[in-house]
């Protein structure tokens, strides 16, 4: 005799407002296999019992959360199989506050994820990012849990909000810092991400050709592929529009740290290099994508990276290291720039 | 406090019979699944059999089929196991045990078990 | 029937150590797997049920793992009360049967 339960996983996450149906089936050598559900912790949902088989409907309500079991039984022998459902409600409602940051200063983000279900710590986590890494220097606040306002009876779904005390971000900023959610399931994690834009003040530093003298907010990708580790980043606008870039010195202020070089003759390079005297070494430690990809060649104090064949400026992060000390330098490259040799 | 008390076991001469009870109390005994499970001495666990919450449904070890029947009394909260054609390997401790629908949560409360010693 | 496999049979250990006792399915039973703790003379004690998920009242430094055919019981860090002989138990399919016993005693 064969024994199956469709889908055959033993925990099964569930969306509010969704159905799902289980199947359990028993195949007999001797008559007819009986099967049926038994409610754990449950109130079952609807249950179609036929010759051989039985199917449970969950209807995607908080009270379909809880074990069931099937039973199949044929002759001498029987045979059980639970299934873990876990009804869950994670929509897209994040709510930021501020609306931006303002570079300079001391300030508190926080973050709000609103008609969630379940409202664990161990379920839900919040992670404030500056590309695709968390923000160093960011200290979290205690989390608080609400009830939300229900128009219906029976659906406790709560809102849970998270703050951070950020250190000054400092000048030049980076463009946004992201606040992402992430609801981890059985089998399935589930992550929603809002975009805090970061006010660029007028002192931030500026490419060439660009004339306004005007404050501006600088916006990133919620995607961006790579992520600073620090707080003392260096930025250029990705504001449209989208000037060439001359070669020059894109660097941190701060206590020797390594300085990072764009060359963007014949292709485009950059050097990271280090001037804090003799014994210390530098190299990239992150760029778009996969490191691994791009051409390195690291001497000591200085360190090359580039793309081969010559191509577009990758868009994203790009970090040097030095050592001893680990103090990082960054690079926010846009995409727009292309390497133009022939342009005047 | 959750309780199970076997009783019933003994000395009895190969081809006899016993039958074991097993008084439950401190839960909803009509709502779980019954075992019988054993250990002859200096041997590991053997499931011997189950019957379901409402005595519909009962299960037995290869080695005892035919031979040992599992009831129940809801009325009484008793479990009992009537052994008959008793063969010197039955001789074991006997512990009765529960669980939720039937087996597969696991066997979470024990008796202390009763001896059953077959010997000529 | 299923075929449960328990190894080591035996192990010696100190109070403190990292303790792995493996159980191995002679067919899929999916996470239906128990495990229990017997000292000598007194009945088996529940420890983890459905695989994983640790039975009230017990400590938690005993965990379990695995689904399908292969599973684990960890001991994080082995107390002089943890000598005792532990024991899997598949719950998928009668005739249920258990594994042989792994005898945790003290190096």
């Known amino acids: 005799q064969s024994f199956q339960v469709n889908p055959p996983e033993s925990e099964v996450a569930v969306a509010m407002g969704t159905s799902l149906q289980i199947t359990c089936s028993m195949s007999c050598d001797e008559g007819v296999a009986r099967v049926h559900w038994r409610g754990l912790d449950t109130s079952l949902g609807s249950v179609q019992t036929l010759p051989g088989s039985s199917i449970l409907s969950v209807r995607g309500m908080l009270s379909d959360t809880g074990t069931p079991v099937c039973v199949g039984s044929c002759g001498s022998r029987s045979f059980q199989h639970s299934v873990k459902i876990l009804v869950y409600a994670f929509p897209d409602q994040l709510v930021v506050s501020p609306e931006f940051l303002v570079p300079g200063q001391d300030q508190v983000v926080s973050c709000t994820a609103h008609n969630i279900w379940p409202a664990d710590p161990n379920s839900l986590s919040f992670a404030l990012l500056l590309g695709e890494q968390r923000l160093e220097g960011a200290q979290a606040l205690e989390p608080e849990q609400e009830e939300e306002i229900q128009e219906a009876e029976g659906t406790p779904l709560f809102r849970m909000t998270q703050r951070w005390r950020l250190p000054s971000l400092g000048t030049p900023a980076p463009p946004a810092l992201h606040c992402q959610v992430t609801m981890q399931l059985p089998k399935l994690v589930l992550t929603h991400r809002k975009e805090i834009p970061v006010l660029q003040s007028q002192t931030s530093p500026k490419p060439p050709n660009t004339t306004s003298a005007e404050p501006y907010i600088l916006t990133s990708s919620s995607t961006a592929e790579a992520v600073s580790t620090g707080l003392n980043i260096t930025t250029l606008p990705s504001a449209p529009p989208y000037p060439k870039l001359s070669p020059r010195t894109l660097s941190s202020e701060g206590p020797c740290r390594p300085k990072i070089h764009q060359d963007l003759e014949a292709g485009w390079e950059l050097l990271c290099e280090a001037s804090c005297g003799p014994g210390v070494t530098v190299r990239w430690t992150l760029a778009p994508g996969d490191l691994a990809t791009y051409h390195k060649r690291e001497a000591g104090a200085q360190a090359w990276l580039s793309v081969l064949p010559p191509g577009p400026m990758v868009e994203g992060w790009f970090q040097c290291r030095q050592d001893p000390g680990g103090e990082v330098t960054n690079l926010y490259v846009p995409g727009q720039v292309t390497p133009n040799s022939s342009s005047t | 406090e959750v309780q199970l008390l076997e009783s019933g076991g003994g000395l009895v001469q190969p081809g006899g019979s016993l039958r074991l009870s097993c008084a439950a109390s401190?839960?909803?005994?009509?709502?779980?699944?019954m075992h019988w499970v054993r250990q002859a001495p200096g041997k590991g666990l053997e499931w011997v059999a189950v019957?379901?919450?409402?005595?519909?449904?009962?299960y037995y070890a290869d080695s005892v089929k035919g031979r040992f029947t599992i009831s129940r009394d809801n009325s009484k909260n008793t479990l009992y196991l009537q052994m008959n054609s008793l063969r010197a390997e039955d001789t074991a401790v006997y512990y009765c045990t529960t669980s939720k629908y039937y087996y597969y949560y696991g066997m979470d409360v024990w008796g202390q078990g009763t001896t059953v010693t077959v010997s000529s | 029937d299923i075929q449960m496999t328990q190894s080591p049979s035996s192990l010696s250990a100190s109070v403190g150590d990292r303790v792995t006792i493996t159980c191995q399915a002679s067919q899929d039973i999916s996470k239906s797997l128990n495990w229990y703790q017997q000292k000598p003379g007194k009945a088996p004690k529940l420890l983890i049920y459905?695989?994983?998920s640790l039975q009230s009242g017990v400590p938690s430094r005993f965990s379990g793992s695995g689904s399908g055919t292969d599973f684990t019981l960890t001991i994080s860090s082995l107390q002089p009360e943890d000598f005792a002989t532990y024991y899997c138990?598949?719950?998928?399919?009668?005739?249920?049967?258990f594994g042989g016993g792994t005898k945790v005693e003290i190096k």
């Open positions: 138990q598949q719950g998928y399919s009668t005739p249920l049967t």
């Open positions: 019957i379901s919450d409402d005595g519909s449904d009962k």
């Open positions: 459905a695989a994983s």
């Open positions: 401190g839960f909803t005994f009509s709502s779980y699944g």
